[in-house]
Structures are given as C-alpha cells and as structure tokens.
C-alpha cells in the first residue's frame, strides 16, 4: 500500500504523459487522478513506466473500479495487463474481440500465463461458444490453444469454426480431443470434393472411425505414414490388407519401418499372413494359414 501524502505544489498531473516516469511512487499516488488515468489509459502503453509505477497505477484503477474495470479501460491496459492477477481478471466482462486481441498482443511471443488463460476463459464463456473469429485469434497467438481444452470444452466448438483450424493447431491434441473434433470437421468439410476434402480432414483423422477410413480407402487418397500412425488403433484393426493398401497408396511401403509400432503392430497381428505377403514388404506376425480366428467380442455381444 502506498501512503496517502499530499501532492507537492506544481506536480498535479494535468494529463498522462512521459513526465510521470520521473515521479516517485508516492508522487504518482498523490498527483495522478484515477479518473484522469481511466480516460487516458491508451497513453500508458506508450510511456516506459517501471513495474513499480505500474503497480501504483493499477492500485488507483482498483480503487476507482472495485467491482472490476469497464471494457473501455481494459482495452487500453497494455503493459498494465502484466500486473493483473487471475482474480482481477475474473471480475471483468470482456465481450469485444478487439479487446481480447489487444491484451493477447501484450503477451505475444510468450507462453500462455494463468492470466491469459483466465482472460480467454472469461471471453469464451461470455460468448457462449468458441466461434470462428475467436478461434482464429486464439490459434494465431497460441497454436496449441485448441489442444489445451478438455473434450467437454471442445464440444462447444461449432463446426463452422473448424475452418479456422490449421494442422499445427492439432499437434498436441490427444485421441479424446480428436474424437470430439473429427465429427465437427467431417460436418464442416462435407461439401468438398474428394482430394480437397482429404487435405482438410487429414489433421483430424486421429478421431475417425473404421467406416470412415474404409470410405477413404476407396478414394485414392494416398495417406502418408505419419497420418496413419496417428489413427485410432481400434479404427485401424478391422481394416483389411487391401483397404490399407488402397488407403496408403504408394506410402504402403512405409509399413515395414513401422511394423513394431502401434497401430501397425496390432493391425499386423489381426491379418492373415497370406494377405500380408501379397504386399511384398516382408511383414511378419500375421495369422498363419489354416488358423481360424474367433472374434470373442462379437460372440459376447450376441449372448
């Protein structure tokens, strides 16, 4: 807390300008009017205040707005945003995308802090859903943003927002997240033709079910091995050798290098060795000829 002291004669601030950087903390407290500060917040960002001085300015705003700052002030916080705590931010009602962008800009190039996470959470909850413009903005600043959300939170993403998602935005998503995102992507891109559709849907295929992979295998998509390795194991297991060959096209040769890794390893164990041999890749571990495969899970479902 800064002690209440009278402002020295001639030092009362008439406007927020660079002369204030030479004020001591107590002088700022005594000589800067909080209402003046609030109306001239846009100037603060252009003045190289010390963090100690910013603490004093924040204290003045806190006294003026104990219930939380109005958006007109929030939008112009600039570096003062670096002094806010998550508790401060929870009092805010941020509705403008411009305000969100202005504050994210302050932290640009740095990893997401608890303050930024709180700000985004407040903003998205206020909007009710993660719309395309918001998602565009957030992934531009934080490519990993989408994958930081829980499956429950992702369920509020409308399919139209999926157009804003770039492949790198999904790099750190786990299968549970892709399970939620894939159906939305399928819906979003449903009117595209085959090759264009595959380019767009490719990043989301870690959430695709078997029937969709079977359908893709009929479309000459030439899926690369990196994408294939990210597919759900349970979705890959029912695919036949012929279907995998069609799905991968010329990339099928890459299976040999991945034969010890999931999902390739588990898929090989489910295929007849005769069928694997038709690929000519030397894949081993399939079911020997003459063996009968009983699908016990199917039997349990019937009983």
């Amino acid at each position: 807390e800064v002690e209440k002291t009278a402002c020295p004669s001639g030092k009362k601030a008439r406007e927020i300008d660079e002369s204030l950087i030479f004020y001591k903390k107590w002088e700022l407290e005594a000589c800067v009017d909080a209402a003046l500060l609030a109306t001239q917040m846009d100037r603060v960002n252009a003045i190289p205040f010390t963090y100690e001085q910013l603490d004093v300015l924040k204290h003045k705003l806190d006294e003026l707005y104990p219930q939380g700052y109005p958006e007109s002030v929030i939008q112009h916080l600039g570096y003062l945003f670096l002094k806010m705590s998550p508790e401060d931010i929870r009092k805010w009602n941020v509705t403008s995308l411009e305000t969100l962008k202005a504050l994210l800009e302050v932290n640009k190039g740095h990893e997401m802090s608890p303050q930024v996470a709180t700000l985004i959470d407040r903003f998205v909850k206020g909007r009710g859903q993660l719309d395309k413009d918001t998602l565009d903005t957030l992934t531009a600043f934080y490519p990993g943003y989408l994958c930081s959300l829980s499956p429950e939170e992702l369920s509020s993403v409308p399919p139209s927002s999926i157009w804003a998602v770039r492949p790198q935005d999904l790099d750190t998503c786990d299968p549970r997240q892709l399970d939620v995102l894939y159906p939305k992507a399928r819906l979003a891109f449903q009117n595209m033709n085959g090759s264009e559709y595959f380019v767009k849907i490719q990043s989301f295929l870690g959430g695709a079910p078997t029937e969709d992979l079977k359908a893709l295998s009929q479309q000459n998509v030439s899926m690369d091995l990196a994408t294939f390795m990210k597919l759900r194991t349970d979705a890959v297991l029912p695919l036949t050798v012929a279907e995998v060959q069609k799905l991968l096209g010329p990339h099928v040769e890459g299976l040999k290098a991945e034969e010890r890794h999931r999902p390739v390893r588990d898929w090989i164990l489910r295929q007849r060795q005769d069928d694997l041999d038709t690929l000519g890749l030397g894949l081993q571990g399939g079911i020997p000829n003459g063996y009968l495969v009983l699908d016990l899970s199917m039997q349990e479902a019937l009983s």
Partner: nanobody, 119 residues
C-alpha cells in the same frame, strides 16, 4: 534472468565528459525498457534517463541537453550514457536497470559505477 554490469565511471573535472556502459547477459531478448539511475550519498535514488523498447529516450530535467542515453540491441553492451558538461552535483553511483516482459514483469539492477566530478 538478466545480469547487468556497469563500467566507465571515474573521476572527472567539472565541464568534462564520461561515457558509461552497461553490459547485459542472460535473457537479453526479453528486455523491455532500460534506465540509468543515480544515487548520491545520503540521497534517494533518482531516475536519470530511460530508453524504451522502441528506442525513445526520456531525460530528467537536471540532465536534459547534457546527457544522452542510447541502446544497442545488437551487442551485449546494451546501454550507454554519454555525460557531457559534468557538474559537481552529478557526483553519484550510476546504476543500470532493465525490466523484462512477462508475468510478473521483473526488474534487474547492476551494482553501479562511481562517477565523481571534482576539481
């Protein structure tokens, strides 16, 4: 973390000149604004000059027109203070300061370099 080391201080006659340097090491890419402060014996530390992250310079009234602050982001010696027309009242320990981006924004200080103006 940022480490700051000042150099260039010394004894100089009134009317003379000195050039102070501040060498920064560590996370120098995260530095935002840089400043020179001074502290005379028995007095409070006072801000002499600031150079902002965009290169704009600001001076205390007592040194305006005599001192020049500059910053070179391409070298580790990031901050300079060219002091001309020195006066006895400029005698002090001159301390380099830098602050960095992020939560919470941190302030870093050098140990200081003594400047004595005396005939």
């Amino acid at each position: 973390q940022v480490q700051l080391v000042e150099s260039g201080g010394g004894l100089v006659q009134p009317g003379g000149s000195l050039r102070l340097s501040c060498a920064a090491s560590g996370s120098i890419s995260s530095i935002r604004h840089m400043r020179w402060y001074r502290q005379a014996p028995g007095k409070q530390r006072e801000l002499v000059a600031t150079v902002s992250n965009d290169g704009s310079a600001y001076y205390a009234g007592s040194v305006k027109g005599r001192f020049t602050i500059s910053r070179d982001n391409s070298k580790n010696t990031l901050l300079y203070l060219q002091m001309n027309s020195l006066r006895a009242e400029d005698t002090a320990v001159y301390i380099c300061n830098a602050d960095t981006w992020g939560w919470p924004g941190a302030d870093y200080w050098g140990q200081g370099t003594q400047v004595t103006v005396s005939s």
